[in-house]
Amino acid sequence: FGISGRHSITVTTVASAGNIGEDGILSCTFEPDIKLSDIVIQWLKEGVLGLVHEFKEGKDELSEQDEMFRGRTAVFADQVIVGNASLRLKNVQLTDAGTYKCYIITSKGKGNANLEYKTGAFSMPEVNVDYNASSETLRCEAPRWFPQPTVVWASQVDQGANFSEVSNTSFELNSENVTMKVVSVLYNVTINNTYSCMIENDIAKATGDIKVTESEIKRRSHLQLLNSKA
């Protein structure tokens, strides 16, 4: 490639998490080159025999790809010229977790960076009033989590209160025998209060809020991936 190997270019990755069964992104950027044909992108996974993905001379070169990644990877070919070497990983598997290396060769030099990729399942919780219950009860449900998360209830009025004695959480294995449905019930709920159902594992943290007043019910939920850092 016409380079001595002594020049190094800056390559930057971001640790990320993949939701199993869905598509994921392994992020990698580098100092761009003016000619696409001079750029080589290699993705490797520590411990895996073949390459995860290779892009060279403006196109994918998959003859050395490991079979565990066959048909599941793609780079954003139109963005390579501006320094985007990120990899799209289709149908994320639990076994995709591990350490990846984004290795770049350009006419300016070579560079690489590692990233930790975690895999699991995470989903947004939904909190509803359970009208079938004998007392005022809230029901928090999230369809897909793995590994098994913890569930903690909190309330705006009773800040710092421990609701473990008045709540019950169950985990039901989904049909694919990996992920689980999370159901948590909170009893003895008071009106004019905001309750939060917080679900967390080592990959993600999700919160479902519900505000119950005599006239209305307001819901809000959000999900945050943990340990996503450069």
Epitope: G5, Q42, L44, E46, G47, V48, L49, E64, G98
Partner: antibody, heavy 117, light 107 residues
Framework: EVQLLESGGGLVKPGGSLRLSCAAS????????MHWVRQAPGKGLEWVAV????????YYADSVKGRFTISRDDSKNTLYLQMNSLKTEDTAVYYC??????????WGQGTLVTVSS | DIQMTQSPSSLSASVGDRVTITCRAS??????LNWYQQKPGKAPKLLIY???SLQGGVPSRFSGSGSGTDFTLTISSLQPEDFATYYC?????????FGGGTKVEIK
Amino acid sequence: EVQLLESGGGLVKPGGSLRLSCAASGFTFSSYAMHWVRQAPGKGLEWVAVISYDGSNKYYADSVKGRFTISRDDSKNTLYLQMNSLKTEDTAVYYCARHGWDAFDIWGQGTLVTVSS
Amino acid sequence: DIQMTQSPSSLSASVGDRVTITCRASQDISNRLNWYQQKPGKAPKLLIYLASSLQGGVPSRFSGSGSGTDFTLTISSLQPEDFATYYCQQAISFPLTFGGGTKVEIK
């Protein structure tokens, strides 16, 4: 500490069998492909066999194909090499090695196999 | 099979010398080339992977370069602990193959 420790070497007659073991510690064994590499006395390095991280793929050097079998037991963090129909030219120090970034990044100390009548 | 040819097979050098070892592959192996150091009675040790990436813990006086069929291992300033045998290895296809080795001896 990341470590590989081979055992099972020894003196065996031509046509005999031997099973080598390689005990791994200090890393997630089940995430790594593993290799066997050998070195005949006073000679260079020769790759023998590899097994993928999940055991689904195995590759062998032509010189051992049909005689040697590589296997792994992730529950015991152990790699194996079953050697049958041994020949005098199989005499060597056998190393197990971890597959890191496209290379043998961690090596065991080796175990000597001597095939002689 | 891909043949790996190392040269020289042996060399004599002094402490502080710049040493260069070459490795040639019988066909294009891109950057899938590794270098190892082996001392008598010891297991080999990985120095360089992917042709030019320095393995963690390896002194920066070791460097690798090349792509395609021609590769070089350079020791910028030879130290007493560097006297050993060095091997290149291709990692692009099975069977994986090593060069014949280069023995670096004290002059």
